[in-house]
């Protein structure tokens, strides 16, 4: 396993619809061909998954099932939108990158982003 | 409605091994996140370890992170928790529970679950 440097700005405001999204760009040594790009949350005494995808270089990115992120590649970069996001959602969001194909196999993990969610205040009743 | 049952708890000493399960009843079972909690005698109810509806993204605890794993069998309806390396301040009443809604979540918290199971006790002596 060889270390890769991995990119991403320190903070990014979520929209008061609950997405955000940022760039996780990556020092890739070589010309991989398979990119494995996973976001983990860290907070709360906690560490989640939150999404994962795995794409060819020039393809779109293809994540999993359960995914409530989407995402697209340029390059050494991954354009990245996490959706429904709530205020408990705040924290520290980790970009990890894997060039999977051809050998050999690097591993770059990113600063991390705080992603800060706020709740949108609900509409006051009106009479109209 | 969702019954959820759990297993495997025992005696076993410090750094030894576990694996509990939770098998639902329900046709939702495999659309929805699922967790593992656990409460200590005198301790409030904390958050363990939760698996996507496809048993693809998973969340821990940090206490636990490296030593537990969660995982799923849809066919079995059936999540798992191994527990290795077990410590004392391990030692609680272990709860499955489904989360609310169906989608995967970027954190986890008890207000997210609902359907809960009777729970199992874990006890690990040094």
């Known amino acids: 396993c060889k270390a890769m440097h991995v990119a991403q700005p320190a903070v990014v405001l979520a929209s008061s619809r609950g997405i955000a999204s940022f760039v996780c760009e990556y020092a890739s040594p070589g010309k991989a061909t398979e990119v494995r790009v996973t976001v983990l949350r860290q907070a709360d005494s906690q560490v989640t998954e939150v999404c994962a995808a795995t794409y060819m270089m020039g393809n779109e990115l293809t994540f999993l099932d359960d995914s409530i992120c989407t995402g697209t590649s340029s390059g050494n970069q991954v354009n990245l939108t996490i959706q429904g996001l709530r205020a408990m959602d705040t924290g520290l969001y980790i970009c990890k990158v894997e060039l999977m194909y051809p050998p050999p196999y690097y591993l770059g993990i990113g600063n991390g982003t705080q992603i800060y969610v706020i709740d949108p205040e609900p509409c006051p009743d009106s009479d109209f | 409605e969702v019954q959820l049952v759990e297993s495997g708890g025992q005696l076993v000493q410090a750094g030894g091994s576990l694996r509990l399960s939770c098998t639902a009843t329900g046709h939702t079972y495999n659309t929805y996140p699922l967790g593992w909690f656990r409460q200590a005698p005198g301790k409030e109810r904390e958050f363990v370890a939760a698996i996507s509806p496809s048993g693809t993204l998973r969340a821990y605890a940090d206490s636990v992170k490296g030593r537990f794993t969660i995982s799923r069998d849809n066919a079995k309806n059936t999540v798992y928790l191994q527990m290795n390396n077990l410590k004392p301040e391990d030692t609680a009443v272990y709860y499955c529970?489904?989360?609310?809604?169906?989608?995967?979540?970027?954190?986890?918290?008890?207000?997210?679950?609902?359907?809960w199971g009777q729970g199992t006790q874990v006890t690990v002596s040094s």
């Open positions: 529970a489904r989360h609310r809604s169906v989608g995967w979540r970027a954190s986890h918290h008890l207000s997210d679950y609902d359907n």
